[in-house]
Amino acid sequence: NFMYSKTVKRLSKLQEYQQYYPSLTCVMEGKDMEDWSCCPTPWTSFQSSCYFISTVMQSWTKSQNNCSVMGADLVVINTKEEQDFITQNLKINSAYFLGLSDPKGWRHWQWVDQTPYNKNVTFWHSGEPNSPDERCAIINFRSEEWGWNDVHCHVPQKSICKMKKIYI
């Protein structure tokens, strides 16, 4: 009976999310393997988040709007492990917008989700950021490593969206 009611609840939750995401990929987790964590297909998952790499070339503002329509934001990178996971799926000859910007050019960098910008957990390439005219951040591959660079916001780039996992 308990299992039946949990299944019914799950199905109704799945139906609720189906109007936003036609397909979800779920895995069982938790100490009793009773919780399901899901990401929209074909998003990838890492820890408690889902990631989507958009190959559509758009400005920073349009990239953020594009993520927003999918219930996500441009990616906020919190740890080196998270960055290493993300970069596994990136192409080394491309650049991707992050959810990091400095809209007033005061070198007050801010994350789209209001996560505090911590200078100790940043992965700027050497010498970056280097221009107050360049107010948006990308991640790209340079000098044999992935790192961040400041660029003009209106120049179209690929982008990475991030959302919290859906738990059912």
Epitope: Q58, S59, W60, T61, K62, Q64, N65, S101, P103, K104, G105, N130, S131, P132, D133, E134, R135, C136, V151, H152, C153, H154, V155, P156
Partner: antibody
């Protein structure tokens, strides 16, 4: 007072090359992103290229990509536009302009008087 | 590319009267409360001159008879009381996304 003085325009045959210069004064050139914009005779304005202050990022529309190269020499306060494989449709007055950011966008706030490029056989 | 369509192509207005120029973008050029549309004035034989940035902000040194409004895809430049020195071609431009694009221009003349 901001001054931008373009030079290097002239008559060139289709397929030929030309190098435009823009001498800047009255502001700290090395800290400014710079752009080129052109205007065909009797027509509207078309953005041609942009270069960031350090010269390491350059941007072009598809119409000139692969043919035009923007560069700068901050020690000489000069902006350049190298134009190769010129076509009749590149005939225009070429303006250099200073770029000023506005949040996530920008404006072109100071413009030179322009230099005329004519591509004709 | 974002296409900007200006209307009318030309406009004849009496001195002291209001002139209104429209600019329509093929997609929204707004983000987070700002609109990325600028207006320029070009007099014969001269380079363009910045009048309005961010849809409604008057550039320093520009007379306050010029004003800009609008958001999303629809923008307007208004000259509240046309002066003889305002005879020119006016262009809108978007800087939301490369390639930057300009409207086709509106020629303002005195009636």
């Amino acid at each position: 007072e901001v001054q931008l003085l373009e030079s290097g325009g002239g008559l060139v045959q289709p397929g030929g090359s030309l190098r435009l210069s823009c001498a800047a004064s009255g502001f700290t050139f090395s800290t400014y992103t710079m752009s080129w914009v052109r205007q065909a005779p009797g027509k509207g304005l078309e953005w041609v290229s942009t270069i960031n202050s350090g010269g390491d990022n350059t941007y072009y529309p598809d119409s000139v990509k692969g043919r035009f190269t923007i560069s700068r020499d901050n020690s000489k306060n000069t902006l350049y536009l190298q134009m190769n494989s010129l076509r009749a449709e590149d005939t225009a007055v070429y303006y250099c302009a200073t770029y000023r950011p506005y949040y996530y966008g920008s404006v072109l706030d100071y413009w030179g008087q322009g230099t005329t490029v004519t591509v004709s056989s | 590319d974002i296409v900007l369509t200006q209307s009318p192509d030309s406009l004849a207005v009496s001195l002291g009267e209001r002139a209104t120029i429209n600019c329509k973008a093929s997609q929204s050029v707004d983000y987070d409360g700002n609109s990325y549309v600028n207006w320029y004035q070009q007099k014969p034989g001269q380079p363009p001159k910045l009048l309005i940035y961010g849809a409604s902000n008057l550039e320093s040194g520009i007379p306050d008879r010029f004003s800009g409004s609008g958001s999303g895809t629809d923008f307007t430049l208004t000259i509240s009381s046309l002066q003889a020195e305002d005879v020119a071609v006016y262009y809108c431009q978007q800087s939301d996304e490369d390639p930057w694009t300009f409207g086709g221009g509106t020629k303002v003349e005195i009636k």
